[in-house]
Amino acid sequence: EQAPGTAPCSRGSSWSADLDKCADCASCRARPHSDFCLGCAAAPPAPFRLLWP
């Protein structure tokens, strides 16, 4: 959950408590288990080669 009093994240990003900032949903492709990815709609999983080249 986003910290009280903080501005909402812009489109394509979601609040990360771990990073204490808005984070790019695009990065969920490489790091799908990041805390903020739950707030990103339909983030695609990483391709097989990116995770295990």
């Epitope: 695009a26 790091r31 080669r49 080249p53």
Partner: antibody
């Protein structure tokens, strides 16, 4: 503020070894992927090696040009990144940059350290 | 490996000019939602600096005269009104897969 400071560069003979270090501060080092990127004199940027997180079993990846010769490592307790370079060649001469990123785009860069391989 | 082709390799422009740099990847670096293309600025003797990530997301603190666009294989970095501090070399980079590769760079010089 974020700071990445490389050290360990210098002049080395072909076939020699060198170990580069990068001291990080100002961000949660253990949460960030780290890479080394190099730039030969007057040339463009070349990605060299990457190391991921403890949760990824510190997975490493290398450019073909350095595979088997270079080893990337990190010490999260010291907020430090390393590059062990063995069997150095003239074509490894470059400024070596330490970079940090959560994923994808390289947000943080050090000032670079020059490695010169020459006899 | 994905090859990145940047053009032009150099250009001369005046303060106030609109400048466009293109980058073409040898294969698509986009999903239906995001493009894994990034742009950096490098000044002589300095480290590169991230300007734009994911094709069009301006990095915090970067002036709004910089913008990025494109998807698939073709991407563009635009400087709407060139300022004296913008004379530098610009690089694109993909993060679609390993190895990450950079374009050859575009040097923006003073006319």
């Amino acid at each position: 503020q974020v700071e990445l400071v490389e050290s360990g560069g210098g002049l080395v003979q072909p076939g020699g070894s060198l170990r580069l270090s990068c001291a990080a501060s100002g961000f949660t080092f253990s949460s960030y992927w780290m890479s080394w990127v190099r730039q030969a004199p007057g040339k463009g940027l070349e990605w060299v090696a990457e190391i991921r997180l403890k949760s990824d079993n510190y997975a490493t990846h290398y450019a073909e040009s350095v595979k088997g010769r270079f080893t990337i490592s990190r010490d999260d307790s010291k907020n430090s990144l390393y590059l062990q370079m063995n069997s150095l060649r003239a074509e490894d001469t470059a400024v070596y940059y330490c970079t940090g990123y959560y994923a994808d785009a390289m947000d943080y860069w050090g000032q670079g350290t020059l490695v010169t391989v020459s006899s | 490996d994905i090859q990145m082709t940047q053009s032009p390799s150099s250009l001369s422009a005046s303060v106030g000019d609109r400048v466009t740099i293109t980058c073409r990847a040898s294969q698509s670096v986009s999903t239906s939602s995001y493009s894994y293309m990034h742009w950096y600025q490098q000044k002589p003797g300095k480290a590169p600096k991230l300007l734009i990530k994911y094709a069009s997301n301006l990095e915090s603190g970067v002036p709004s005269r910089f913008s990025g666009s494109g998807s698939g294989t073709d991407f563009t970095l635009t400087i709407s009104s060139l300022q004296p501090e913008d004379f530098a070399t610009y690089y694109c980079q993909h993060s679609w897969e390993i190895p990450y590769t950079f374009g050859g760079g575009t040097k923006v010089e003073i006319k």
